[in-house]
C-alpha cells in the first residue's frame, strides 16, 4: 500500500531512508536538458523474494537535443559538482547500510539523473531526520517518521526534532546538547 503523502517536513532539516521497503517506487527523473529514453521505464521498483530484494527496471536519460542516442554529454562545471554530490551521497548510503530483509538499498546513480530523487513510499517505511548544516538540534526526540495505516488511511508519524540557527544555547549548567544521529548521513530529501 502506497503512502498517500510525503513524509512531514521539518524546518531546517532533511530526511533520508536507510533502506526502502519492497513496493517503493523511485521516479526516473532526468536533469534539465535530458529526458527518459523512449523505451525506458518511468520508475524503478523495489521487489524481492524471501531472501533478496533489488530494484526492478533501470532509469536511463538521454539528451533532449539528441533524437535516438544515449550519447554522453559532458556536464558543465556546476552540473559536475551536483553530480559528484549525488554520487558521493549514494556511495555513502551504500557504505553505511546493512541489509534489511524485505528492503532495497539506495539505488546507484544513473547518467544525467535529476539532482533530487522522488520516492513513492509504502506503509511501514521509516525515514530519519537531521538538521541541515549550519543548524543544530534544539530538541531531539524521536527524529524519525513512520508511514502507518490507520482507519483505512495512511499517515506519517510526526518527528519530534526542532532545528535552530540560534547559536548560544540557554542550557542547564553542566548539561550537554544531545548527540545528533550519526553525522555525515546523506540527505536524500530536503524539506526547506
Amino acid at each position: 500500500e502506497l503512502c498517500d503523502d510525503d513524509p512531514p517536513k521539518i524546518t531546517h532539516a532533511t530526511f533520508k531512508a536507510v533502506a526502502y521497503k519492497e513496493g517503493t517506487m523511485l521516479n526516473c527523473e532526468c536533469k534539465r536538458g535530458f529526458r527518459r529514453i523512449k523505451s525506458g521505464s518511468p520508475y524503478m521498483l523495489c521487489t524481492g523474494n524471501s531472501s533478496h530484494s533489488s530494484w526492478d527496471n533501470q532509469c536511463q536519460c538521454t539528451s533532449s537535443a539528441a533524437r535516438n542516442t544515449t550519447k554522453q554529454v559532458t556536464p558543465q562545471p556546476e552540473e559536475q559538482k551536483e553530480r559528484k554530490t549525488t554520487e558521493m551521497q549514494s556511495q555513502m548510503q551504500l557504505a553505511d547500510q546493512v541489509s534489511l530483509p524485505g528492503h532495497c538499498r539506495e539505488p546507484p546513480p544513473w547518467e544525467n539523473e535529476a539532482t533530487e530523487r522522488i520516492y513513492h513510499f509504502v506503509v511501514g517505511q521509516t525515514v530519519y531526520y537531521q538538521c541541515v548544516q549550519g543548524y543544530r538540534a534544539l530538541h531531539r526526540g524521536p527524529a524519525e517518521s513512520v508511514c502507518k495505516m490507520t482507519h483505512g488511511k495512511t499517515r506519517w508519524t510526526q518527528p519530534q526534532l526542532i532545528c535552530t540557527g540560534e547559536t548560544e544555547p540557554s542550557q542547564f549548567p553542566g548539561e550537554e546538547e544531545p548527540q545528533a544521529s550519526p553525522d555525515g548521513l546523506p540527505e536524500s530529501e530536503t524539506s526547506r
Epitope: 517536513k9 521539518i10 524546518t11 534544539l138 510526526q158 544555547p169 540557554s170
Partner: antibody, heavy 115, light 107 residues
Framework: QIQLQQPGAELVRPGVSLKISCKGS????????MHWVRQSHAKSLEWIGV????????IYNQKFKGKATMTVDKSSSTAYLELARLTSDDSAIYYC????????WGQGTTVTVSS | DIQMTQTTSSLSASLGDRVTITCRAS??????LEWYQQKQGKSPQLLVY???TLAEGVPSRFSGSGSGTQFSLKINSLQPEDFGSYYC?????????FGGGTKLEIK
C-alpha cells in the same frame, strides 16, 4: 492517558515573580519539547518560547526575553515558566503545549496581577 | 515575524451547514500550519497539523487544505460540539505566531 497538569489560578502582587509548573504524564517526557503560550483578551494567543525537555536548551520569542524563563526538571517530568516583575499587563492564561505540533495542551493557569 | 491573518473574526452558521474558515500567512510557510479549536473556558485542541493531516480522534468532517500563504479549514455538516473559536498557527520558524481567531456561533 496523556496529560499536562497545571495549577488552575495564581493571584500575585505587581512587581513580584511567579513560577508556573506543567507536569507531563502518560508519555515519555523527554521525547517532546514543551512550548509555553499566553492568552489574553487583548492579544489572542502568543507564543512565549520552547524548551527542550531533554537538554534544557530554549528559544524565546524576543518579546518575552527578560520577562519569561523556561526550565525543566526531568526527574519529576515537569516544565516551568517563571515570569519576572509582574505587571497588570501580564494578567492572562498561560498554557504549556507539547511537541512540534502542540498536540496536547495543559488546562492553563490563570494569572491575575493585582494589588 | 510572520503574521497570520484570519480575516473573519466571527461567523454564524446553522447545524448541518458546511463552513470554511480561512487563514493567510504574510510569507510562504509551505505546509507548516496547524489548526486548533477552543471552546469557552477550555484549552485549545489540535485539529489539523501540517496543513492537512487530521489529528488523532478528530472527526472526518474536518479537513485542512492549502500551502504557501493561503490555508483553509472546512467543516462538513456542522455539529453542536463544533461551535467555538478556531485558530491557525505556523511552525515554520521561530517565533511561531497565531491568527487572531474565528469565532463560530450558532445562527
Amino acid at each position: 492517558q496523556i496529560q499536562l497538569q497545571q495549577p488552575g489560578a495564581e493571584l500575585v502582587r505587581p512587581g513580584v515573580s511567579l513560577k508556573i509548573s506543567c507536569k507531563g504524564s502518560g508519555y515519555t517526557f523527554t521525547d517532546y519539547a514543551m512550548h509555553w503560550v499566553r492568552q489574553s483578551h487583548a492579544k489572542s494567543l502568543e507564543w512565549i518560547g520552547v524548551i527542550s525537555t531533554y537538554s534544557g536548551d530554549a528559544i524565546y520569542n524576543q518579546k518575552f526575553k527578560g520577562k519569561a524563563t523556561m526550565t525543566v526538571d526531568k526527574s519529576s517530568s515537569t516544565a516551568y515558566l517563571e515570569l519576572a516583575r509582574l505587571t497588570s499587563d501580564d494578567s492572562a492564561i498561560y498554557y504549556c503545549a507539547r511537541g512540534v505540533t502542540f498536540d496536547y495542551w495543559g488546562q492553563g493557569t490563570t494569572v491575575t496581577v493585582s494589588s | 515575524d510572520i503574521q497570520m491573518t484570519q480575516t473573519t473574526s466571527s461567523l454564524s452558521a446553522s447545524l448541518g451547514d458546511r463552513v470554511t474558515i480561512t487563514c493567510r500567512a504574510s510569507q510562504d510557510i509551505s505546509n507548516y500550519l496547524e489548526w486548533y479549536q477552543q471552546k469557552q473556558g477550555k484549552s485549545p485542541q489540535l485539529l489539523v497539523y501540517n496543513a492537512k493531516t487530521l489529528a488523532e480522534g478528530v472527526p472526518s468532517r474536518f479537513s485542512g487544505s492549502g500551502s504557501g500563504t493561503q490555508f483553509s479549514l472546512k467543516i462538513n455538516s456542522l455539529q453542536p460540539e463544533d461551535f467555538g473559536s478556531y485558530y491557525c498557527q505556523h511552525h515554520y520558524d521561530t517565533p511561531y505566531t497565531f491568527g487572531g481567531g474565528t469565532k463560530l456561533e450558532i445562527k
